[in-house]
Interface confidence: medium
């Protein structure tokens, strides 16, 4: 099933996804992909965690929450209309057929007000790509960069609203949070 989330052009979009680790530090690998969750793995991977850390990401996609506590919500920085679409959060619980997968629909709306042109920070220059890695499947043979040092105030109001406990409970009810162990 799909849950819909909205953001405006130029904002950071927030796509919530949570699980409850069986024990502190007992992490489960997670992948985020652009597109609905396929048969297995994530299609068109944009970010991945393993049992210890974020081990793969692409330039505008990052985890702002405490993924070590199971908050694997995805932040997409400075969205454009092209970022609209379905995203897959897949919690890769070991074992056969155990994966939890969530399809989240991101709708990008044009900005209400066009601000005066400002010089955008060049993340390519600020955070050079410096490492190539191979993980599971071909999607990981890409370059990595350092995570942007970004101010929390840049996160859209949607992100803050979604942290509200009432909404968090709604998310749990809709199946976007799972407990492991």
């Amino acid at each position: 099933s799909e849950v819909e989330y909205r953001a405006e052009v130029g904002q950071n979009a927030y796509l919530p996804c949570f699980y409850t680790p069986a024990a502190p530090g007992n992490l489960v690998p997670v992948c985020w992909g652009k597109g609905a969750c396929p048969v297995f793995e994530c299609g068109n991977v944009v970010l991945r965690t393993d049992e210890r850390d974020v081990n793969y990401w692409t330039s505008r996609y990052w985890l702002n929450g405490d993924f070590r506590k199971g908050d694997v919500s995805l932040t997409i920085e400075n969205v454009t209309l092209a970022d609209s679409g379905i995203y897959c959060c897949r919690i890769q619980i070991p074992g056969i057929m155990n994966d939890e997968k969530f399809n989240l629909k991101l709708v990008i709306k044009p900005a209400k007000v066009t601000p005066a042109p400002t010089r955008q920070r060049d993340f390519t220059a600020a955070f050079p790509r410096m490492l190539t890695t191979r993980g599971h499947g071909p999607a990981e043979t890409q370059t990595l960069g350092s995570l942007p040092d970004i101010n929390l105030t840049q996160i859209s109001t949607l992100a803050n609203e979604l942290r509200d406990s009432r909404l968090a409970n709604d998310l749990r009810d809709s199946g976007a949070t799972i407990r492991i162990g």
Epitope: G35, G43, G95, R134, Q142
Partner: antibody, heavy 114, light 112 residues
Framework: QIQLVQSGPELKKPGETVKISCRAS????????MNWVKQAPGKGLKWMVW????????TFADDFKGRFAFSLETSASTAYLQIINLKNEDTATYFC???????WGQGTSVTVSS | DIVMTQTPLSLPVSLGDQASISCRSS???????????LHWYLQKPGQSPKLLIY???NRFSGVPDRFSGSGSGTDFTLKISRVEAEDLGVYFC?????????FGGGTKLEIK
């Protein structure tokens, strides 16, 4: 329903170039990666490449890094495989297969003969 | 590269019989995330391969329950409980755990 439709058979001479296509329908093209797989006559399957259709970035098997080019026309939901300087050993059926190889095209036969 | 070895090369069966195909990999196919990306395909003459079983034992949509997969690590088996005429063709195992993705050489299921 999900379909991958490939272009028709090709007969080429050694040294020539061939370009075959794979048109996807029934799903959003850029939401799933695309593979190309080679099958020589009477032989098994050999994975060639996986292309991230969202970023355009390919990952090759080592055997297919030289004379093989893989491209996308996302507006037409189409992936392309081009082989330059064709050799006899390129004679095969080439399949496109979606993402985790759950759906396949019907295959395109390429025959290289002088 | 991971080498996938299938046995037997050819498997003559009578309709209604059980058939069993083995696939062995040169390295463990257990990924660091705990999953095992071993899949089975059937290719009928003149057709493209069709996914039957993914991740060792999960039937793809529309695949009859007479097909089952099992195994772990490096040794895997595809079983067909009661062979029907439409099951004839070449069966391939495939691994997606390690790049490059590789296939077994195939097992031809044919009538005795």
């Amino acid at each position: 329903q999900i379909q991958l439709v490939q272009s028709g058979p090709e007969l080429k001479k050694p040294g020539e170039t061939v370009k075959i296509s794979c048109r996807a329908s029934g799903y959003t093209f850029t939401n799933y990666g695309m593979n190309w797989v080679k099958q020589a006559p009477g032989k098994g399957l050999k994975w060639m490449v996986w292309i991230n259709t969202y970023t355009g970035e390919p990952t090759f098997a080592d055997d297919f890094k030289g004379r093989f080019a893989f491209s996308l026309e996302t507006s037409a939901s189409t992936a392309y495989l081009q082989i330059i300087n064709l050799k006899n050993e390129d004679t095969a059926t080439y399949f496109c297969a979606r993402d985790t190889m759950d759906y396949w095209g019907q295959g395109t036969s390429v025959t290289v003969s002088s | 590269d991971i080498v996938m070895t299938q046995t037997p090369l050819s498997l003559p069966v009578s309709l209604g019989d059980q058939a069993s195909i083995s696939c062995r990999s040169s390295q463990s196919l257990v990924h660091s995330n705990g999953n095992t990306y071993l899949h089975w395909y059937l290719q009928k003459p003149g057709q493209s391969p069709k996914l039957l079983i993914y991740k060792v034992s999960n039937r793809f949509s529309g695949v009859p329950d007479r097909f089952s997969g099992s195994g772990s690590g490096t040794d895997f088996t595809l079983k067909i409980s009661r062979v029907e005429a439409e099951d004839l063709g070449v069966y391939f195992c495939s691994q997606n755990t390690h790049v490059p993705w590789t296939f077994g050489g195939g097992t031809k299921l044919e009538i005795k």
